[in-house]
């Protein structure tokens, strides 16, 4: 049985204020059943960045087509970057539970930092 891997290829992503940042995340299996969510930070105080199923995330778009079948690409784009967006971003697989989903596996994280302003 293939064990699920959460792949976040970039350890560090340098971004520019006002631009769009792309955070990559791919998975190697559709199992276990359950959604993938994006967070900034870890622990109980982490911030939910994107949940495709519910919520309103006006600055976030998905890289893959949301009508695509059996999607394994959970990359996102965050527009209009500000200094407040810096931090480490994690894509996290949840296992479907009833009533609550349970965290199953997290990617290694991508640190978003501000790069030098273009001259």
């Amino acid at each position: 049985e293939e064990e699920l891997q959460m792949i976040q290829p970039e350890k560090l992503l340098l971004v520019t204020v006002g631009k769009t940042a792309t955070l990559h995340c791919t998975v190697t299996s559709l199992l276990p059943v359950g959604p993938v969510l994006w967070f900034r930070g870890v622990g109980p105080g982490r911030e939910l960045i994107y949940n495709q199923k519910e919520g309103h995330f006006p600055r976030v778009t998905t890289v893959s087509d949301l009508t695509k079948r059996n999607n394994m690409d959970f990359s996102i784009r965050i527009s209009s970057i500000t200094p407040a967006d810096v931090g480490t971003y994690y894509c996290v697989k949840f296992r479907k539970g009833s009533p609550e989903n349970v965290e199953f596996k997290s990617g290694p994280g991508t640190e978003m930092a501000l790069g030098a302003k273009p001259s």
């Epitope: 699920l4 276990p32 495709q52 059996n70 296992r95």
Partner: antibody, heavy 120, light 108 residues
């Protein structure tokens, strides 16, 4: 081509057991969730159970009596049915789950079904 | 549990006619609806998923629409091979996955 072939159906008495099998081919069996859906004679479709990796889900009507399992080395899905009742009489379909977007499962391929009859 | 109500229960139609099926959910399911066709003695066949996306190989006379609680499956011009029973299914909130009771399409 995706193929799902069920077997193991038959006639049993109330309280007895039966084990259904579903042989799958034509896709990467181990990375997909799989389900059983049943249809009583002349009735509509009723979801029975789904299995992911080792995560399993059941309809209330079968919880505690039915057990879904899979053997990825054999590309086979199973449904162990214990304490069978007359109301379990149905055609049992094996179905491959498909996801869309970032979550949400439906059934994109179905087997032809196997008939289970529970009668005294 | 989300209840899906399909109407009408039966439709009597002539080939070439436009046919519309309704599926109403007891609560918001966004666009997490699939439609299946089942012919007598056969397994169900996926037609539409995500409310409006046609499955591979499904003729374009089949179309789906709707979001929230009200969904529609339309066959623009019914062919003789389209007779059978049509089911909707929700996958927004499960377990359990739930199906509508079906709409039977018969020859007028």
């Amino acid at each position: 081509d995706v193929q799902l072939v069920e077997s193991g159906g038959g006639v049993v008495r109330p309280g007895e057991s039966l084990r259904l099998s579903c042989a799958a081919s034509g896709f990467s069996f181990s990375i997909y969730a799989m389900s059983w859906v049943r249809q009583a004679p002349g009735e509509g479709l009723e979801w029975v159970s789904t299995i992911g990796a080792d995560d399993t889900y059941y309809a209330d009507s079968v919880k505690g009596r039915f057990t879904i399992s899979r053997d990825n080395s054999k590309n086979t899905l199973y449904l162990q049915m214990n304490s069978l009742r007359a109301e379990d009489t149905a055609v049992y379909y094996c179905a491959k789950d498909s996801t869309v977007g970032w979550s949400g499962d439906f059934f994109d391929y179905w087997g032809l079904g196997t008939l289970v009859t529970v009668s005294s | 549990e989300i209840v899906l109500t399909q109407s009408p229960a039966t439709l009597s139609v002539s080939p070439g006619e436009r046919v519309t099926f309704s599926c109403r959910a007891s609560q918001n399911v966004r666009s997490d609806i699939a439609w299946y066709q089942q012919k007598p003695g056969q397994a169900p066949r996926l037609l539409i998923y995500a409310a409006s996306s046609r499955d591979t190989g499904i003729p374009d006379r089949f179309s789906g629409s709707g979001s929230g609680t009200d969904f529609t499956l339309t066959i623009s011009s019914l062919q003789s091979e389209d007779f059978g029973v049509y089911y909707c299914q929700q996958y927004y909130d499960w377990p359990p996955f739930t199906f509508g009771g079906g709409t039977k399409v018969e020859i007028k």
